[in-house]
């Protein structure tokens, strides 16, 4: 894995990524930026879109590229899977062309793993938003992971993804 | 229609302090950030400071840092430049610029600009 | 700093000619890249984004390309509208930074 200065995790400076799930990050981030400084000022451009509210994924999957998910364990970043992409570009774009602009070649959703398997970790995010949320009352953290079965231990419930992390170390997918 | 207005500018001694100021309309003001970009007589375009559409944010050139702060008033939809310690070569036609751009940043919309000028 | 470095400073053409104005950043920038068009006495204004996504309004003789450190400005006819000065500038990384421009004059 390398050095451990190299794979040090830095808190999340930045106020929008804030309370999204998970508070470490580690740059470059996934469109090369080396400051958290210089993914906020970029970060900031899509305000009107997240004001619109097109997606209701959409400032997750935006912190996921600009200041992805670090963990001391494991030596690279973790993003956003391809199909958050998707979803959100397809909630998304339409509203970008009525501002007058493309959607960004950065956020190309084929760059992204298509999903979370054991080659390509990614974060899939709060789920397909055409689908209701199965609870209709608040979870309290750390009661889903029961539903995994008798691994239950190996998990930690993930507030903003609303599903089951893998805890590192683990052999298995990072989610459920 | 989008619009932004720039005042403020005029005379000033080397030392002396200006503050701009840019009043926005057409667009919802609190969703963008602002930026200044100033052009020296026959010179090019220099960016000067950027803020975010929160307010929370706040980046300069090093030019500028530590003499210059920008700020805004969104129940004004104004922004300002706060210009201290000015020097000469801080001569210049100062532009308000909305930056946008959806993941790079990009002005927009420019003001028509104010000038500053900066002698004995 | 990342510096920009445009070529040439200014060039003399005729209307109906094409025109490459050249942009080049000083460390990758990816596609980080935009142009403006000034008139004298005029605010600039914004014509291509993101190196090569010409922006709303803007005509199609507009066009740009290029990634990492070299980019390109073509007009594909130049129009009496077009003589102007030309800037990129990047928005990789802070400071924003300008190329010094080029001035696009009548032959």
């Known amino acids: 894995f390398g050095d451990e200065e190299e794979r040090r995790c830095d808190p999340i400076r930045i106020s929008m990524c804030q309370n999204l799930g998970y508070n470490v990050t580690k740059m470059p981030n996934l469109v090369g930026h080396e400051l958290q400084t210089d993914a906020e000022l970029q970060l900031t451009t899509f305000t009107p879109l997240i004001q619109y509210g097109c997606s209701s994924q959409l400032q997750f999957f935006l912190c996921s590229v600009y200041v992805p998910m670090c963990t001391e364990k494991i030596n690279i970043p973790i993003g956003p899977c391809g199909g958050m992409c998707l979803s959100v570009k397809r909630r998304c774009e339409p509203v970008l062309k009525e501002f007058g602009f493309a959607w960004p070649e950065s956020l190309n959703c084929s760059k992204f793993p298509p999903q979370n398997d054991h080659n390509h970790m990614c974060m899939e995010g709060p789920g397909d938003e055409e689908v209701p949320l199965p609870h209709k009352t608040p979870i309290q953290p750390g009661e889903e992971c029961h539903s995994v079965g008798t691994n239950s231990d190996q998990y930690i419930w993930v507030k903003r993804s609303l599903n089951c992390v893998l805890k590192c170390g683990y052999d298995a997918g990072l989610y459920s | 229609e989008v619009q932004l207005v720039e005042s403020g500018g005029g005379l000033v001694k080397p030392g002396g302090s200006l503050r701009l100021s840019c009043a926005a309309s057409?667009?919802?003001?609190?969703?963008?950030?602002m930026s200044w970009v100033r052009q020296a007589p026959g010179k090019g375009l220099e960016w000067v400071s950027a803020i975010s559409g929160s307010g929370g944010s706040t980046y300069y050139a090093d030019s500028v840092k530590g003499r210059f702060t920008i700020s805004r008033d969104d129940s004004k939809n104004t922004l300002y430049l706060q210009m201290n310690s000015l020097k000469t070569e801080d001569t210049a036609v100062y532009y308000c610029?909305?930056?946008?751009?959806?993941?790079?940043?990009?002005?927009?919309?420019w003001g028509q600009g104010t000038l500053v000028t900066v002698s004995s | 700093d990342i510096q920009m470095t445009q070529s040439p400073s200014s060039l003399s053409a005729s209307v109906g000619d094409r025109v490459t104005i050249t942009c080049r950043a000083s460390q990758s920038i990816s596609s980080y890249l935009n142009w403006y068009q000034q008139k004298p006495g005029k605010a600039p204004k914004l014509l291509i984004y993101?190196?090569?996504s010409l922006q709303s309004g803007v005509p199609s003789r507009f066009s740009g390309s290029g990634s990492g450190t070299d980019f390109t400005l073509t007009i594909s006819s130049l129009q009496p509208e077009d003589f102007a000065t030309y800037y990129c500038q990047q928005s990789y990384s802070t400071p924003l930074t300008f190329g010094g421009g080029t001035k696009v004059e009548i032959k």
């Open positions: 057409g667009f919802t003001f609190t969703n963008y950030a």
């Open positions: 993101a190196a090569s």
């Open positions: 610029a909305r930056a946008t751009g959806f993941g790079t940043v990009v002005f927009d919309y």
